[in-house]
Structure formats: structure tokens, C-alpha cells
């Protein structure tokens, strides 16, 4: 359990308050983290509070600027990098955003041997994405879909490849779909350890569908945004990957790597790029159907001047239970030997840990074991494995750091978070330096987060990087809502739950029961983290309860409940959150008269079944950008889960889980649906589905559109959204204004 | 406040060798990352070589295998030896740390290799 302190006395009662919907929209009560820009094994760069950028050395204990906020300022820059050689920065200006991650922008190189920026061969804008090599300086950059290379900053620039167009062919950038749902990067281009090879991927749209929707602007027409977005089922980009020579890229040009004979016999994708030395390379791809990922090693044949992939270094990884991986296929941590590598994935026990293949998959060696999970390994150094799980006294929601001694046998494990702030701090995260010399660790809650510096040798706790007193004092005087995380038992199930409870909680009253879910695959709502955002405002300020239960198809409990909703989305998901309902209703303390239900994205989608499952234990609920029917979304997301929708595979269940077939059971409920009409991801076309379906069965309910808005509904249209849901949501629940 | 001094600089015969020196001072460590920088008459600072905190060294292409950055933290000191000096190496070289210390240059020492 789980209590966040309320700090109630009756003597100080009066000096104590409520949380705004003010508080939570002007972001009055939000943390910070500290995250260092690691230069070396002992040194890190910072951006002061003023905007110098400052060097710290551990080990001296000295820091200095090594850019002032001026030069900052003199091109309006909001990023920066130092080069690798340390002789030059880019500055990074004009920031426009594109999808989750990508962005263009403008560079500038600041040259710090004589203060100036470079003059001549000046980079060209916007460009898509740039980098620094990892030793010296050279720069690799995309531009107009296309790859460059300079060898200096000042040096004209080499260009790598030519056919590059808009929407059509992507070099060295991700298209929508692996950008979103494969890549999660900005950028599809590797460096080699030390720079001599440059690896890219190349993206072929030509033949996906385009999904078209307006843009309304202040135009006197609007524009129509066309984004290449492979539906499930549709035709997919057609990937390759690339490596060149950087230190003489005209010599044989970009070569191709092989796709392994066992992936290219039909549709695939390509997953991820480890570099393992400056001439050997591990690629990982998958099957178009999701349970099969084949990892390769390649190496690089001076004689052809080409990359040999031997089928003695492919391993293959397959899921007969459900698909490869949890959200993504993990990828590779490669020990010191250049071939042998640590990955977390399924033992026999259905529990994700960590291997270790020196082979073969089949001789893998487990290194963790336990009905727990590993969750992501961090560094691997000579003698240590850094990596973090929620073993510690098998709370799911919570991550701690161990340390698994590999340098001894037989290996010793130690955490080494979970006795440091025990009460504070159940979550963790953390940044290694070079040779994990040193290492930040960030710790996200339950208590107010606090970011600390560490010994890579002692794990002494050498200084606190950021405290947040500035959050905990604006906290003293605020009546914070309690929190417990528990479980309950329901047919061999096991559901985490998360309920937040007004400050002056009594359970022998009835109070207003809010919802929150997600409940996507591989997803998890009920984490051990520190916020106040708008459901801690509810409880706090309006005296709702709030649950956030994690059901079947959530993550890091183990692949029983990972996989019970796969090829059948939008069953269980659902049938557990309203398990979990009738449970908290036996508690005693829940108005059963006003239950709601809200969610967002896949949450919508699940608020949405719920709403519409005929069990009368909702009175209302809210959409906000839900999918509604899976064949209107992304390929690679959906038939990971769904399989394909073709008559032969899935088709049915495509169906019968759309939100629209079950339009007639909305009408006993109050609905509110609320979408973006830019929304990239979850196309606006979902929610206007449901709304003629609704209107077709002539099915009351409530809308809410926000134009030119994409999936997450930011800036004003924020503050928009959440007053109109705050006052649906009173309404419903009979509170008064 | 930070100061770095830099000494040795001279006239030389191309073909000759220098060892220049920087004491650190000010409460300026010299373990930080340090490097040589240099610049010639009518051009613009340029860098010549680095030693990390951790002891790696790395050079300009213009001066590798001929100059030599070293340290000794007993005296809070960097060193670069020059061998095999050419005319073109004629400037005026700075120490500083690396990545340098913003508007933080000392007066530097001059080295004129002639021919």
C-alpha cells in the first residue's frame, strides 16, 4: 500500500487547500528532472537555469561555461550537441514539429576554438536530422529526404544518397509508421563506433494508401495534409539498409545489407541496428505476421568491400503464444567480446528476462529468473550489468536498479535503489557514463521525484542533481488526495489497481467512482510514480474516487496476462475493468449511481466498449481521440495483435470489436467523444464514424471537435478539454459548480 | 578566477622542437580535459590537440606524430611538445581546458619557426 501523506491536521485545516483546476492547467505543481549530458566517464554537460551551457567534472569537482546564454540567444537556440572532439557545437533553432518524434529544424555550427560560428558551406534548412559522428567531428545530416556528409563543419558536403522525395522514398528518416510504431525515433541512421561506417535505412512508400484530411488554418481553403499511413492489411513501406564508408563514402558508394533468406520470403519489417565494433553490425527484423524476429550479425569483408551475414550468426526468436517481444523486440546489449550479447525475452516460464547468448538461442544462458519481470538492461561493463525489474517485493508497478556482478562467479545481484529513499522513491530510471564510471539515477516517485549522482564502482550517492524544494514547499499547504495500490484476485487473474482518495477520505461514506484506463497491450497504468495532474484534482477538489486497473494485456506481470488479449482486442480488457468495478462497488464506499469511465486513445476505445457493454454500472463516460474500429489503424500496431483482416486470418474479430457495431448500447449512458481533426494517429475518421453510428441507431450523446488539433490535443485546446470534461463529469456526477 | 599561463614559446629552425607548458592556476584543476590551441597571423584559432580527464589524447591532422600533449597533476601543469616543427606551425598558442572556458584565454606564447 501506498500512502501519499495529505498532511491534515485539524489545528491547520484552515490554512490548507484544495487542488485547482488552475493549479493543474497552469502547471503549478510540476517536477523536474535532471538528466546529465554525459561528455565522458567522468563529465557532463548541463543547461543552467540561465541558459549557459556548463561542463562538470566529477572528479575535480570544477565546472565551467563553455557557451554562454548570448551565443544561445545571437540564433535563438533551443538545443544544442558538443562534437565528440569537443571543438564545435551545433546549435539547434526553429524548431517545428512534425509526428511524435520528428522535427525539422535550423543548425548552426559554433566553432569554440575561436568563438565564431563556421562561415562558408553553411548547412542548408530545414533540415530533417543531424548528428555528429561519435568520434571527431563529422556530421551526417538529412535534408530533403536525402543523406549528407560533411568531414569538417566547414567542408562542403558529401551527398549519400539521391533519391530521396517527399512522401515517397525516406533516407536516413523514418516514414509515419516505423517512426510511430516501430523505430521510435526521429532519425533512421547509425554511426559506427568510431565513425568509419555509417548504416541507413531507406523507406519506399510508393504504394501505401495516403490518408488525407484538412487542415483549416486561416485560409480561405483549407489544406489538405496526404501522410503515406499503412491501414492494417494495406500495402506496407518496403525497407533496406545501407552502410557506407564515411572515410572515402565515393570509393564503392552506400552498400546494401542481406535480409535474412527465412524474413525476405514474405512481408517484414525491419526492427533495429546495433553496431557491435567499427566492422560488425547486428540488424533485427521481423515477420509481417509478429511472432517470428530474426537477428543478424553481419561483418564486413574488406577483400568485397561488402557485409557477409552468415546464417551461423542469425538467431531466431518466436512466440508461440502470442507476438515476439513485449511492446517492441528488445534489443541486443553486446559484451566485450564483440559477438556473445545480453537480452531480456520470454523463459519458459512466460516471465521476460535476461539472457545471455554466446551461440545459439537454444543454449541461451537465463541470467534473472522469478514470477517478475526484467524490464531493460542499461550497461554492460566488463564486470557489471546494470539492468531494472519490479521484483522488489513484487509490486509490478514499481522499478529499482540492480547490478548483476559478471566479472565473478557464480554472479552476484545487488539493488541497488531499492533501500535509498524506500518511501520516496519506488521507480526509478538511470544514465550511465562512459565505462559506467559514474551514473545519474532519476527517481519518479510515489514521493516527489529527486534526481542524485552516483559512484559506478560504489554506488555511494555522491550528490543530489535536482530535489524539487521549490514543488515541496508549493505542496505544504495543499490537501493532496491519499493514494494505495493493492490488488485483487478474480479468477486466477491478478488486477493492480491505483485508487487516489480525497484528502478526508471516510469509508463509511459513498462517494463518486471515476475510471481512468488505457489498458492497451504491453501498457501499465498503475506505476508507482509521483503526479498531480487532473484526477488528483477530482479527489482532491471534487471528492471523486478515482481507479486505474491494469487487466489482461498489460505489461511486466508475465506473458498469461501479456498475451490473453491477443488476436482479440477489445474483450478482455474491458471485461476486467468492469471485474474490477463490481469490486470496489463491494467495498462499501462507492455511490453505485454515478460510476463514469474515461480514456484516451486506446483508453477511448476501451471506455467506449465499457460504456457500451449493457452491464448498466456506467451512468457516463468519455471518449477522447478513441480508435474505433481496428481496420483504421496503423498495420504494424494492430495486426501485432490482431493478425491480418482477411477472411482467411482475423476478419471477423476486426469486426465484431468495432465500438460501432454496439452504437444501440450507448443509450442508456451519457457519452462524451472528443477528437482532433488533425490527428495523424488516430485518424478524426474514427470518431466520426462513431458519431453516425450513434446518430443512424438516433442515439443521443455529447461531441467535442478541436480543429486542426492532432492526437494530443495540446496548448489552449488543453486547457479546453479539460474544463469541458471537469464540468460533464459534474454534471453527471450531480456536483454542484 | 581561473588563469592559465602559457611558456615556452621561442624561435626555432624548422625541423626543431619546442616544449610548451600552461600552469593551471585560480583553483583551476588541470585533470579537467585540457588541449592546445593555436593561432596563426591573419587567421582564426584553431585547435591542435587534447588530453581527455582520463588521460586519451587526440590531435589535429596538421600535427599528428610530430606534437605530443601530456600532463603532470603533481604540478597542475599541461605540456605540448612540438617535434619536427614546419613553418606553417608559426602562431601564437593558447592553452585551455577542452572544451575551452568560455572568455577564458590567456595572453598565449609565440612560436615562430623559420626556415
Known amino acids: 500500500i501506498v500512502l501519499r501523506p495529505s498532511r491534515v491536521h485539524n489545528s491547520e485545516e484552515n490554512t490548507m487547500r484544495a487542488l485547482t483546476l488552475k493549479d493543474i492547467l497552469n502547471g503549478t505543481f510540476s517536477y523536474k528532472t535532471f538528466f546529465p549530458n554525459w561528455i565522458s566517464g567522468q563529465e557532463y554537460l548541463h543547461q543552467s537555469a540561465d541558459n549557459n551551457i556548463v561542463l562538470y567534472n566529477i572528479e575535480t569537482g570544477q565546472s565551467y561555461t563553455i557557451l554562454s546564454n548570448r551565443t544561445m540567444k545571437s540564433v535563438n537556440a533551443s538545443n544544442y550537441g558538443l562534437s565528440p572532439d569537443r571543438q564545435f557545437v551545433y546549435l539547434e533553432s526553429d524548431y517545428s514539429k512534425l509526428w511524435r518524434y520528428s522535427y525539422t529544424a535550423t543548425y548552426y555550427i559554433y566553432d569554440l576554438s575561436n568563438g565564431e560560428f563556421v562561415r562558408g558551406n553553411e548547412l542548408p534548412r530545414p533540415i530533417q536530422y543531424l548528428c555528429w559522428s561519435p568520434v571527431g567531428s563529422k556530421l551526417a545530416y538529412v535534408y530533403q529526404n536525402n543523406i549528407y556528409l560533411k568531414q569538417r563543419p566547414g567542408d562542403p558536403p558529401f551527398q549519400i544518397t539521391f533519391n530521396g522525395r517527399e512522401n515517397k522514398i525516406f533516407n536516413g528518416i523514418p516514414d509515419w509508421v516505423y517512426e510511430e510504431e516501430m523505430l521510435a525515433t526521429k532519425y533512421a541512421l547509425w554511426w559506427s563506433p568510431n565513425g568509419k561506417f555509417l548504416a541507413y535505412a531507406e523507406f519506399n512508400d510508393t504504394d501505401i494508401p495516403v490518408i488525407a484530411y484538412s487542415y483549416y488554418g486561416d485560409e480561405q481553403y483549407p489544406r489538405t495534409i496526404n501522410i503515406p499511413y499503412p491501414k492494417a492489411g494495406a500495402k506496407n513501406p518496403v525497407v533496406r539498409i545501407f552502410i557506407i564508408d564515411t572515410t572515402y563514402p565515393a570509393y564503392v558508394g552506400p552498400q546494401e545489407v542481406p535480409v535474412p533468406a527465412m524474413i525476405a520470403s514474405s512481408d517484414y519489417y525491419f526492427s533495429w541496428l546495433t553496431w557491435v565494433t567499427d566492422e560488425r553490425v547486428c540488424l533485427q527484423w521481423l515477420k509481417r505476421v509478429q511472432n517470428v524476429s530474426v537477428l543478424s550479425i553481419c561483418d564486413f569483408r574488406e577483400d568485397w568491400q561488402t557485409w557477409d551475414c552468415p546464417k551461423t550468426q542469425e538467431h531466431i526468436e518466436e512466440s508461440r503464444t502470442g507476438w515476439a517481444g513485449g511492446f517492441f523486440v528488445s534489443t541486443p546489449v553486446f559484451s566485450y567480446d564483440a559477438i556473445s550479447y545480453y537480452k531480456i525475452f520470454s523463459d519458459k516460464d512466460g516471465y521476460k528476462h535476461i539472457h545471455y547468448i554466446k551461440d545459439t538461442v537454444e543454449n541461451a544462458i537465463q541470467i534473472t529468473s522469478g514470477k517478475w519481470e526484467a524490464i531493460n538492461i542499461f550497461r554492460v561493463t566488463q564486470d557489471s550489468l546494470f539492468y531494472s525489474s519490479n521484483e522488489f517485493e513484487e509490486y509490478p508497478g514499481r522499478r529499482n536498479i540492480y547490478r548483476i556482478s559478471i566479472g565473478s562467479y557464480p554472479p552476484s545481484k545487488k539493488c541497488v535503489t531499492c533501500h535509498l529513499r524506500k518511501e520516496r522513491c519506488q521507480y526509478y530510471t538511470a544514465s550511465f557514463s562512459d565505462y559506467a564510471k559514474y551514473y545519474a539515477l532519476v527517481c519518479y516517485g510515489p514521493g516527489i521525484p529527486i534526481s542524485t549522482l552516483h559512484d559506478g564502482r560504489t554506488d555511494q550517492e555522491i550528490k543530489i542533481l535536482e530535489e524539487n524544494k521549490e514543488l515541496e514547499n508549493a505542496l505544504k499547504n495543499i490537501q493532496l488526495p491519499k493514494e494505495e495500490i493493492k490488488k485483487l484476485e478474480v479468477d486466477e487473474i491478478t488486477l493492480w489497481y491505483k485508487m487516489i482518495l480525497p484528502p478526508q477520505f471516510d469509508r463509511s461514506k459513498k462517494y463518486p467512482l471515476l475510471i481512468q484506463v488505457y489498458g492497451g497491450p504491453c501498457s501499465q497504468s498503475v506505476r508507482s510514480v509521483f503526479a498531480v495532474n487532473w484526477i488528483s484534482y477530482l479527489a482532491s477538489k471534487e471528492g471523486m474516487v478515482i481507479a486505474l486497473v491494469d487487466g489482461r494485456g498489460t505489461a511486466f506481470q508475465g506473458d498469461k496476462l501479456l498475451y490473453a488479449v491477443y488476436r482479440k482486442l477489445g474483450v478482455y480488457e474491458v471485461e476486467d475493468q468492469i471485474t474490477a468495478v463490481r469490486k470496489f462497488i463491494e467495498m462499501g464506499f462507492i455511490d453505485e449511481k454515478r460510476i463514469a469511465i474515461w480514456g484516451w486513445s486506446y483508453g477511448g476505445y476501451v471506455s467506449s466498449l465499457a460504456l457500451a457493454s449493457g452491464t448498466g454500472l456506467f451512468k457516463c463516460g468519455i471518449a477522447v481521440a478513441p480508435v474505433s474500429s481496428w481496420e483504421y489503424y496503423a498495420s504494424v500496431y494492430t495486426e501485432r495483435f490482431m493478425g491480418l483482416p482477411t477472411k482467411d486470418d482475423n476478419l471477423e474479430h476486426y469486426k465484431n470489436s468495432t465500438v460501432m457495431a454496439r452504437a444501440e448500447y450507448f443509450r442508456n449512458v451519457d457519452y462524451l467523444l472528443i477528437h482532433g481533426t488533425a490527428d495523424d494517429n488516430v485518424h478524426f475518421q474514427n470518431s466520426a464514424q462513431i458519431a453516425k453510428a450513434l446518430v443512424n441507431a438516433q442515439v443521443d450523446f455529447q461531441a467535442m471537435w478541436y480543429s486542426d488539433q492532432n492526437h494530443g490535443l495540446s496548448g489552449l485546446s488543453t486547457n479546453h478539454l479539460y474544463t469541458h470534461m471537469t464540468h460533464f463529469l459534474k454534471q453527471c456526477f450531480s456536483l454542484s459548480d | 578566477q581561473v588563469q592559465l599561463q602559457e611558456s615556452g614559446g621561442g624561435l626555432v629552425q624548422a625541423g626543431g622542437s619546442l616544449r610548451l607548458s600552461c600552469a593551471a592556476s585560480g583553483g583551476f584543476d588541470s585533470r579537467n580535459a585540457m588541449g592546445w590551441y593555436r593561432q596563426a597571423p591573419g587567421k582564426r584559432r584553431e585547435w591542435v590537440a587534447t588530453?581527455?580527464?582520463?588521460?586519451?589524447?587526440n590531435y589535429a591532422d596538421s600535427v599528428k606524430a610530430r606534437f605530443t600533449i601530456s600532463r603532470d597533476n603533481s604540478k597542475n601543469t599541461v605540456y605540448l611538445q612540438m617535434n619536427s616543427l614546419k613553418p606553417e606551425d608559426t602562431a601564437v598558442y593558447y592553452c585551455?581546458?577542452?572544451?575551452?572556458?568560455?572568455?577564458?584565454w590567456g595572453q598565449g606564447t609565440q612560436v615562430t619557426v623559420s626556415s
Open positions: 588530453i581527455t580527464s582520463d588521460g586519451r589524447t
Open positions: 585551455n581546458a577542452a572544451p575551452p572556458i568560455f572568455g577564458s
